[in-house]
Interface confidence: low
């Protein structure tokens, strides 16, 4: 069954199915591109992005990118197609209902990225280690 937050009326030109044949609809994501952030040394943070966007393509998911260097901290929130790399990285966790940050190797900065597939899921970004990828619940596709 499709969870309530993705129950939208079906437009034939917008239907996309995942590998299990479940119907997928355009995602609702926070979409503020790159903004300065005060999120630091916390288990989780809200994006503080007040722009909600409906993704252009049904296959796109929500993405958040947290970056820290000597000068500032930024948080990027966007929609993105998980079939395509983002910042040169594959979106490995695109099926997760929650945005669980994972560190990526980038010279000269600390770089975390997460992706997820529930409405506005990139509004709440999670750094806490209790939400690691060994948790099988987070690996479930949201269309069950």
């Amino acid at each position: 069954t499709i969870p309530p937050h993705v129950q939208k009326s079906v437009n034939n030109d917008m239907i996309v199915t995942d590998n299990n044949g479940a119907v997928k609809f355009p995602q609702l994501c926070k979409f503020c591109d790159v903004r300065f952030s005060t999120c630091d040394n916390q288990k989780s943070c809200m994006s503080n992005c007040s722009i909600t966007s409906i993704c252009e393509k049904p296959q796109e998911v929500c993405v958040a990118v947290w970056r820290k260097n000597d000068e500032n901290i930024t948080l990027e929130t966007v929609c993105h197609d998980p079939k395509l790399p983002y910042h040169d990285f594959i979106l490995e966790d695109a099926a997760s209902p929650k945005c669980i940050m994972k560190e990526k190797k980038k010279p000269g900065e600390t770089f975390f990225m997460c992706s997820c597939s529930s409405d506005e899921c990139n509004d709440n970004i999670i750094f806490s280690e209790e939400y690691n990828t060994s948790n099988p619940d987070l690996l479930l596709v949201i269309f069950q």
Epitope: K8, M14, I51, T52, I54, D119, E120
Partner: antibody
Framework: EVQLVESGGGLVQPGGSLRLSCAAS????????MTWVRQAPGKGLEWVSV????????YYADSVKGRFTISRDNSKNTLYLQMNSLRAEDTAVYYC???????????????WGQGTLVTVSS | DIQMTQSPSSLSASVGDRVTITCRAS??????LNWYQQKPGKAPKLLIY???SLQSGVPSRFSGSGSGTDFTLTISSLQPEDFATYYC?????????FGQGTKVEIK
């Protein structure tokens, strides 16, 4: 062709209620966020409220928060604005508008209805 | 809320004139700035989005520029149908506030 047609405006006494409707056609209504914008006579534009395509996300201007409720019926391609506890300062033409949905157009309203006049007076 | 200030509030110009309207935001809004045209008794019409992108169907004599806090709408050669009121709007954050408008009148 994208069309937005508002209805439900009229004369109402202070403290009264009114429900505006906006019938949408010519586009896939349920994947667009929709907004209400108002314009008092001889004045500028004031954003009132927005609702996401699924109806799950809403925002309101402080001036109407707690009094106005935005909603939508995607099966009827219709947007609503329930206005309660109306005040004289709510007198305006109310426009229904479609919010552009993607990337650099986010937040811009690309199609507007012709508006419906709400007059709050005793 | 982010305050948007337009100048001038009104201007008189002739057909063929180059017209410039400015819009200033009370804080940086990156390029999240839109311009609308409104004629008396009509609904607003989107002209420019994202500070400088021309909306489909809008004549190329309209152009926008700026980023951060200062923005400009330029009409390169004013046409009779351009006499109207122009509004800027920030869409950087909710609520997406409008400027007070600039009325372009015939000289």
């Amino acid at each position: 062709e994208v069309q937005l047609v508002e209805s439900g405006g009229g004369l109402v006494q202070p403290g009264g209620s009114l429900r505006l409707s906006c019938a949408a056609s010519g586009f896939s209504f349920d994947i667009y966020a929709m907004t209400w914008v108002r314009q008092a006579p001889g004045k500028g534009l004031e954003w009132v409220s927005v609702i996401s395509g699924s109806g799950g996300t809403t925002y309101y201007a402080d001036s109407v928060k707690g009094r106005f409720t935005i909603s939508r019926d995607n099966s009827k391609n219709t947007l609503y604005l329930q206005m309660n506890s109306l005040r004289a300062e709510d007198t305006a033409v109310y426009y229904c508008a479609r919010r552009a949905q993607y990337r650099d157009k986010v937040g811009a309203t690309d199609y507007w209805g012709q508006g419906t006049l709400v007059t709050v007076s005793s | 809320d982010i305050q948007m200030t337009q100048s001038p509030s009104s201007l008189s110009a002739s057909v063929g004139d180059r017209v410039t309207i400015t819009c200033r935001a009370s804080q940086s809004i990156s390029s999240y700035l839109n311009w609308y045209q409104q004629k008396p008794g009509k609904a607003p019409k989107l002209l420019i989005y994202a500070a400088s992108s021309l909306q489909s169907g809008v004549p190329s004599r309209f152009s926008g520029s700026g980023s951060g806090t200062d923005f400009t709408l330029t009409i390169s050669s004013l046409q009779p149908e351009d006499f109207a009121t122009y509004y800027c709007q920030q869409s950087y954050s909710t609520p997406p506030t409008f400027g007070q408008g600039t009325k372009v009148e015939i000289k």
